[in-house]
């Protein structure tokens, strides 16, 4: 097999063999190498010399193959916008941010730019579990049968009703979606409001 051309090489149709790693330089009508992530163009290519790439200086980065003559400035995660850092900026990657706990992304422009507090889920409901934390606001769903949740909270989970018999007790009042089962000692008398039903 014939060896492929290595940049710089002439291109009459203004396209390059590897669009990701090469670019067309119209002045010389040649294809030149782009610079790899973490670097920038320190010397442009010519007909006899390929692009020279230098490493981005501290606190700057380039994430992709590029023919930029500068690196992008690293930006911190803005706590005022509800963001926190999960991975620092490097020469090859911008600072990785996410919404702070209890918040969701309210404004998205290629990445999250603004987070807001998650809505509370009322008693008897819980927030539907999402694939990615912080991606959207809470969608509250009712507790499934045999479970309860008794607060207004963005994060509280429905808990299973207590089983009185597991504790050697008997049920005094059944659990609901908003309250746990009430248990009592089997020897205790019924509360006054229930004594009528016992007489029956």
């Amino acid at each position: 097999s014939q060896p492929q051309a290595v940049p710089p090489y002439a291109s009459e149709n203004q396209t390059c063999r590897d669009q990701e790693k090469e670019y067309y330089e119209p002045q010389h009508r040649i294809c030149c190498s782009r610079c790899p992530p973490g670097t920038y163009v320190s010397a442009k290519c010519s007909r006899i010399r390929d692009t020279v790439c230098a490493t981005c200086a501290e606190n700057s980065y380039n994430e992709h193959w590029n023919y930029l003559t500068i690196c992008q400035l690293c930006r911190p995660c803005d706590p005022v916008m509800g963001l926190e850092e999960i991975a620092p900026c490097t020469s090859k990657r911008k600072t990785q941010c996410r919404c702070q706990p209890g918040m969701f992304c309210a404004a998205w422009a290629l990445e999250c730019t603004h987070c807001e507090l998650l809505s509370d889920c009322p008693p008897g409901t819980e927030a539907e579990l999402k694939d990615e934390v912080g991606k959207g606001n809470n969608h509250c769903v009712p507790c499934k049968a045999g479970h309860f949740q008794n607060t207004s909270s963005p994060s509280a989970r429905c808990q299973p009703h207590t089983r009185c018999e597991n504790q050697g007790l008997v049920e005094a009042a059944p659990g609901t979606a908003q309250s746990d089962t009430t248990c009592k000692n089997p020897l205790e008398p019924l509360p006054p409001e229930m004594s009528g039903t016992m007489l029956m």
Partner: antibody, heavy 122, light 108 residues
Framework: QVQLVQSGAEVKKPGASVKVSCKAS????????MYWVRQAPGQGLEWMGW????????NYAKKFQGRVTMTRDTSISTAYMELSRLRSDDTAVYYC???????????????WGQGTLVTVFS | EIVLTQSPGTLSLSPGERATLSCRAS???????LAWYQQKLGQAPRLLMY???RRATGIPDRFSGSGSGTDFTLTISRLEPEDFAVYYC?????????FGGGTKVEIK
């Protein structure tokens, strides 16, 4: 602790291909670029290229373009380096190396595999 | 591509002596993006220094690095028996990264 464990020694005939594996553990595999460096017997170190395990993006040294392919399998935290159309001067120890994790640009190598000897002879 | 030339090729010294290893670049290495490695026979290289003068984790303070631009130096203040090995410099300031040819530090 960080470990890079490479596949065993290989003996190949000229014109054949070899595929060396490098299993990573002790860190997030997709978080750092993986590099391949080779060393011919009694010679110095030679950079071959890198792979971004997160995206699968690669960068090969010009000398190896068209002959080397770097891939990864994130499900088993393993990087691979395949070199084709082997010649006798490809006889070398092949190392995988993880880029550094401190300092700004991290294209120096803090952790290395134990090396895989590839011998090419007819 | 930046070519790194290491000198001397071999350095014969006794334990306790000071070792000075040189690494010269064919062009300026931006931001002192230079690393040093130690390699013993049959082993993988071990990172000693990065950023020209920053010691890697677990490296004893008898190892120090200096220099900028095109001239860099690795100094071992007092050679210990375990320091006899081959030392390589590597630049990562310009793509592609490159290694020097190595300096062997042997027992006199």
């Amino acid at each position: 602790q960080v470990q890079l464990v490479q596949s065993g020694a290989e003996v190949k005939k000229p014109g054949a291909s070899v595929k060396v594996s490098c299993k990573a553990s002790g860190y997030t595999f997709t978080g750092d670029y993986m590099y391949w460096v080779r060393q011919a017997p009694g010679q110095g170190l030679e950079w071959m290229g890198w792979i971004n395990p997160n995206s699968g993006g690669t960068n090969y040294a010009k000398k190896f373009q068209g002959r080397v392919t770097m891939t990864r399998d994130t499900s088993i935290s393993t990087a691979y380096m395949e070199l084709s159309r082997l010649r006798s001067d490809d006889t070398a120890v092949y190392y995988c190396a993880r880029e550094g994790s401190s300092g700004w640009s991290a294209e120096y190598f803090q952790h290395w595999g134990q090396g895989t000897l590839v011998t090419v002879f007819s | 591509e930046i070519v790194l030339t290491q000198s001397p090729g071999t350095l014969s010294l006794s334990p306790g002596e000071r070792a000075t290893l040189s690494c010269r670049a064919s062009q300026s290495v931006s931001s002192s993006f230079l690393a040093w490695y130690q390699q013993k026979l049959g082993q993988a290289p071990r990172l000693l220094m990065y950023g020209a003068s920053r010691r890697a984790t677990g490296i004893p303070d008898r190892f120090s690095g200096s220099g900028s631009g095109t001239d860099f130096t690795l100094t071992i203040s007092r050679l210990e028996p375990e320091d006899f090995a081959v030392y390589y410099c590597q630049q990562y300031g310009t793509s592609p990264l490159s290694f020097g040819g190595g300096t062997k530090v042997e027992i006199k």
